[in-house]
């Protein structure tokens, strides 16, 4: 089990590092988006895992962004961002097979309404129970 957890961490960390770099190979990314969305978590250790991903990064002082799958829908009533940005992107999470282009990548400010827990604990718990 420890070996499985280590392998899972390695795969996830690699997926985060390479997020958005190859529009033709998005299965792992979309699967991880789905995990974050379902487990209500963000990143492996912490949301800050995402800050090194250049394709998500904002300019200058607004650098810190995370994928829309980290967005906590239940913590906001900001209908503008929900209707225009988040919901169209999250609706794709049920259709993981569809390929994605880098222009489709959806990112939100990490200081807004996001899941603040990393996914490691939730996934480890799930592994222990299965």
């Amino acid at each position: 089990r420890a070996q499985l957890e280590r392998s899972l961490r390695d795969v996830v960390e690699k997926t985060i590092q390479k997020y958005g770099t190859n529009p033709e190979e998005t299965a792992a990314e979309e699967s991880w988006d789905y995990v974050q969305f379902q487990l209500r978590c963000c990143g492996w250790h912490y949301p800050q895992d995402w800050f090194q991903v250049l394709i998500l990064r904002g300019n200058g002082s607004e650098a810190h962004r995370v994928p829309c799958s980290c967005y906590n829908l239940s913590a906001t009533n900001d209908s503008t961002i929900l209707d225009k940005v988040i919901l169209p992107q999250l609706s794709r999470l049920g259709h993981l097979a569809r390929s994605r282009h880098s222009a489709d990548i959806c990112a939100v400010p990490a200081e807004s309404h996001i899941y603040r827990e990393g996914c490691a604990q939730g996934l480890q718990k799930w592994l222990h129970n299965n």
């Epitope: 002082s61 650098a63 810190h64 906590n72 906001t76 900001d78 400010p109 200081e111 309404h113 603040r116």
Partner: antibody, heavy 115, light 107 residues
Framework: QVQVQESGPGLVAPSQTLSITCTVS????????VSWVRQPPGKGLEWLGV???????NYHSSLKSRLSIKKDHSKSQVFLKLNSLTAADTATYYC?????????WGQGTLVTVSS | DIQMTQSPSSLSVSVGERVTITCRAS??????LAWYQQKPGKSPKLLVN???NLADGVPSRFSGSGSGTDYSLKINSLQPEDFGTYYC?????????FGQGTKLEIK
Amino acid sequence: QVQVQESGPGLVAPSQTLSITCTVSGFSLTTSGVSWVRQPPGKGLEWLGVIWGDGSTNYHSSLKSRLSIKKDHSKSQVFLKLNSLTAADTATYYCAKGGYSLAHWGQGTLVTVSS
Amino acid sequence: DIQMTQSPSSLSVSVGERVTITCRASENIRSNLAWYQQKPGKSPKLLVNVATNLADGVPSRFSGSGSGTDYSLKINSLQPEDFGTYYCQHYWGTTWTFGQGTKLEIK
């Protein structure tokens, strides 16, 4: 443009509670974090805590039991409360826009703890 | 909590010279690091975030680098207005800390 301004009491007696208000403009408290940092006279910076866009908070581990950060969206204000003050809490207290890196700082308010 | 150790604690440098300030974290902070400049009697100013990303309006003579536990801030061709105290700050985990500061004086 972004503006951040602290207002505090100046002088507080030992064992009392410090209350500081940070009034912001030029950005939304729903999408940005606001952090608090203090600096004792002649010393370095000490991170105190942050309140995120969703209202959740992170606190300095050694101040957790004494520190509270809240906000009022309608007034664009963030509030810091620090209780059971001692002379070691004498410092300039800053609020800043940003939860991770702190991009815009207020001018700071000097708080002296003394009887 | 993660400790941040800056070096040197102070330095005196001539205008036009190159300066390097380093910051070491007590554990891997995965590039979640910012640098600030503070002048006497003033509020700190953000220079760099995510270890290498220059903040808005910061001159290109400033640059950040590093990964893991070791980070540095370089100032190419020091200008008179660059004096002050420089601080690093990590934001990995759930509580952040600053380095103790590096005081930069113009020779």
